[in-house]
């Protein structure tokens, strides 16, 4: 028989965690697991439990995590990596829509995230969507064009800025921008 299937690793309520706020990392394998190992990659730090409760998020806890489990003498494949991001480390960027936050269906709009600092990475989140749109950009701003807008693009957007040197330490979120598709 081949290696044991990989467990899942999730962060609750979210993998984007404001500084000083709580988060729980949970590794989930099949029934009958003898031992879990949850490790913080690139740090030599680990624990032998399935659940890591972080009562207050700190910079030192931001980074990549993965977990695996043992049944008998066999170890599972490692879980997919989880990127735990500390937010609120830096001041919030500003988010604007060009030409404006109200756009006709079928039209084009560009969301622009701008910061006063020399960050080279930006992430745009739409409320309700699990994954961000990430955009590397150098000149203190990033553009997220939305071509041929549909009703599905309506919603609340926020952006973050960060540096590729510390990719898990992010700014506070921008003020929300409501995109209205008419």
């Amino acid at each position: 028989s081949g290696p044991l299937p990989k467990p899942s690793l999730q962060a609750l309520p979210s993998s984007l965690v404001p500084l000083e706020k709580p988060v729980t990392l949970r590794c989930q394998g099949p029934p009958g697991v003898d031992l879990y190992r949850l490790e913080k990659l690139s740090s030599s730090r680990y624990q032998d439990q399935a659940v890591l409760f972080i009562p207050a998020m700190k910079r030192s806890l931001a980074g990549r995590y993965r977990c695996s489990y043992q049944q008998g003498s066999l170890w599972s494949l490692p879980s997919d990596q989880l990127e735990l991001v500390a937010t609120g480390v830096f001041a919030k960027p500003s988010l604007s829509a060009q030409p404006g936050p109200a756009v006709s269906s079928g039209g084009d709009v560009t969301l622009q995230c701008q910061t006063r600092y020399g960050f080279d990475q930006f992430a745009l989140y739409k409320e309700g969507d699990p994954a961000p749109y990430k955009n590397p950009e150098r000149w203190y701003r990033a553009s997220f064009p939305i071509i041929t807008v549909t009703a599905a693009h309506s919603g609340t957007y926020r952006c973050y800025s960060f540096s590729s040197r510390d990719p898990y330490l992010w700014s506070a979120p921008s003020d929300p921008l409501e995109l209205v598709v008419t």
Epitope: S44, Y46, L52, S60
Partner: nanobody, 129 residues
Amino acid sequence: QVQLQESGGGLVQAGGSLRLSCAASGVTFDSAAMAWFRQVPGKEREFVAVISTESGGRTDHADSVKGRFLISRDNARHMVYLQMNSLNPEDTAVYYCASSLLYCSASGCYANRDSYDYWGQGTQVTVSS
């Protein structure tokens, strides 16, 4: 809210003793590694000692304090202690209590300040000659 509160610092004559205490709240104390660091103004924060819950409480002390300082912990009271004997003026510093949520698997990891997640405000220890 996680809080680490140091106490027990003060002024002591060379050759004397002090016992520092650290009260921890808001952290899963019995699964954490606890450590003491110290800092002299203008210098890096320096590792002093660590005690973890691995193997019933593994301890390690910096070479500069071995045989003079002893770290211990009381899990029931959520306390960590640093018994400091044979103090000399070079031990003058602000002493900080630190807590790590995770264990270390590599040598030197516990001596690295980046391995600790929560810090106290510090207590001043002054050793006069």
